[in-house]
């Protein structure tokens, strides 16, 4: 039961995480104009991975896509790549994990196959989460560097009468969404890997041992004993539920004392 719970929870956590990674990647607020000294601004700038936007105090918002590929900073391209790799791996991981779920029966798939699929999806989730965290962190580092550079520029070259206000950018909401989502995907992946250990049928075949007693020759030959961690399903007491299909939600809503195979 605990294996099913761990696997199910890992799947759900990863699902939320990957949804968050997708949301973060699509969000426009990766960097937002720093409103130091000025909480109410007439023109507010914010930028995403794909476009930059300007919101005026009139309520008018204009967004412009980055229609160039070669003209973009290498770091931005790297962040885009990391986020896309994270999404792709996460999506594949989700697909694999659906079939690996213990509560879903597909043909006569053995536990060993489900265990392998669970491990595969878990590793994919871990890598996906790491990609997202790395992407967001690279972008954040880029922001911090640019922030201090623009701060330095603000106080230099102001010998003349005319001042030019340098727009400084700080962390946008997407960065926090990305960090949290990456973390959730990572946690979900770890949970899947832990669940895999419980699913894996550890075959420990004990050899027949002969005990020679005087006068009698009695051999005790126990059958192939399947070691159980306490989480796996007992092969002799397997209960196959064929009384109608159950959705995953129903499984979570109405837990049974039996494990679902």
């Amino acid at each position: 039961m605990a294996v099913t719970a761990c696997q199910g929870l890992g799947f759900v956590v990863s699902l939320i995480g990957i949804a968050g990674i997708i949301a973060a990647t699509c969000m426009d607020q990766w960097s937002t104009q720093d409103l130091y000294n000025n909480p109410v601004t007439a023109v507010f700038n914010y930028q995403g991975l794909w476009r930059s936007c300007v919101r005026e105090s009139s309520g008018f918002t204009e967004c412009r896509g980055y229609f160039t590929l070669l003209g973009l900073p290498a770091m931005l391209q790297a962040v885009r790549a990391l986020m896309i790799v994270g999404i792709v791996l996460g999506a594949i991981g989700l697909l694999v994990s659906i079939f690996a779920l213990k509560c879903i029966r597909i043909g006569s798939m053995e536990d060993s196959a489900k265990a392998n699929m669970t491990l595969t999806s878990g590793i994919m989730f871990i890598v996906s989460g790491l990609c997202a965290i790395a992407g967001v962190s690279v972008f954040a580092n880029m922001l911090v560097t640019n922030f201090w550079m623009s701060t330095a520029n603000m106080y230099t070259g102001m010998g003349g009468m005319v001042q030019t206000v340098q727009t400084r950018y700080t962390f946008g909401a997407a960065l926090f969404v990305g960090w949290v989502a990456g973390g959730l995907t990572l946690i979900g992946g770890v949970m899947m890997c832990i669940a895999c250990r419980g699913l894996a049928p550890e075959e420990t075949n004990y050899k027949a041992v002969s005990y020679h007693a005087s006068g009698h020759s009695v051999a005790y030959k126990p059958g192939g004993f399947k070691a159980s961690t306490g989480f796996g399903s007992n092969t002799k007491n397997k209960k196959i539920y064929d009384g109608g299909a159950r959705t995953e939600d129903e499984v979570q809503s109405y837990p049974s004392k039996h494990d679902y195979v």
């Epitope: 104009q33 000025n38 109410v40 601004t41 007439a42 023109v43 700038n45 914010y46 930028q47 930059s52 936007c53 300007v54 005026e56 105090s57 009139s58 309520g59 008018f60 204009e62 412009r64 005319v162 001042q163 030019t164 206000v165 727009t167």
Partner: antibody, heavy 115, light 113 residues
Framework: EVQLVESGGGLVQPGGSLRLSCAVS?????MNWVRQAPGKGLEWVAW????????TYADDFKGRFTISRDDSKNTLYLQMNSLRAEDTAVYYC???????????WGQGTLVTVSS | DIQMTQSPSSLSASVGDRVTITCKSS????????????LTWYQQKPGKAPKLLIY???TLESGVPSRFSGSGSGTDYTLTISSLQPEDFATYYC?????????FGQGTKVEIK
């Protein structure tokens, strides 16, 4: 079509108070109050986000003037306290539009501060 | 606060003349986010409310005749009336629309010569 109609102007003694109203019809995201002293130029007074109620003021009016709105009545207000002779002007309400330009203006209401 | 300085404060011109009004800001009005200059031009006739002519320094408001044009970037801006018409005799104001507090120029009065 947006229409703005101001009211509430009149004669008030120095130190007195007055509340100007601006009846708004049509879509308005944010609004301003702008004033013009007789024979002088335009002077921006205050801005308000009509949805959040977030205001901002010109330095000369902070603490004395309060911009607000009533969603139910679709009305913009300017509460003016501690009025001085130099506050004598025509007060306009104006809608902020694309490029932060003011595209629709009311007809203006005259406020005279005199003893 | 951003100071706006208009010149000249008044000018006399005849119908059909090309008129140029300049406006200088104490700070750049160019927004790096969209590369647009947040400068607005208004026309005001005596006893009337101002009328929006140009926003983003050069974008003509709908319904405004094409003889009006705006140009400039950073701190220097210009309003040009290519061929002055009788209804164009009025006072023109430039406005900082980039940051609060919004500030206006002192105005340029265009009179009949």
């Amino acid at each position: 079509e947006v229409q703005l109609v101001e009211s509430g102007g009149g004669l008030v003694q120095p130190g007195g108070s007055l509340r100007l109203s601006c009846a708004v019809s049509g879509y308005t995201f944010s609004m301003n109050w702008v004033r013009q002293a007789p024979g002088k130029g335009l002077e921006w007074v205050a801005w308000i986000n009509m949805y959040t109620g977030e205001p901002t003021y010109a330095d000369d009016f902070k603490g004395r003037f309060t911009i607000s709105r009533d969603d139910s009545k679709n009305t913009l207000y300017l509460q003016m306290n501690s009025l001085r002779a130099e506050d004598t002007a025509v007060y306009y309400c104006a809608r902020l539009s694309k490029g932060n330009g003011m595209d629709y203006w009311g007809q203006g209401t005259l406020v005279t501060v005199s003893s | 606060d951003i100071q706006m300085t208009q010149s000249p404060s008044s000018l006399s011109a005849s119908v059909g003349d090309r008129v140029t009004i300049t406006c200088k800001s104490s700070q750049s009005l160019l927004n790096s986010g969209n590369q647009k200059s947040y400068l607005t031009w208004y026309q005001q006739k005596p006893g009337k409310a101002p009328k929006l002519l140009i926003y983003w320094a050069s974008t003509l408001e709908s319904g405004v005749p094409s003889r009006f044009s705006g140009s400039g970037s950073g701190t220097d801006y210009t309003l040009t009336i290519s061929s002055l018409q009788p209804e164009d005799f009025a006072t023109y104001y430039c406005q900082n629309a980039y940051s609060f507090p919004f500030t206006f120029g002192q105005g340029t009065k265009v009179e009949i010569k």
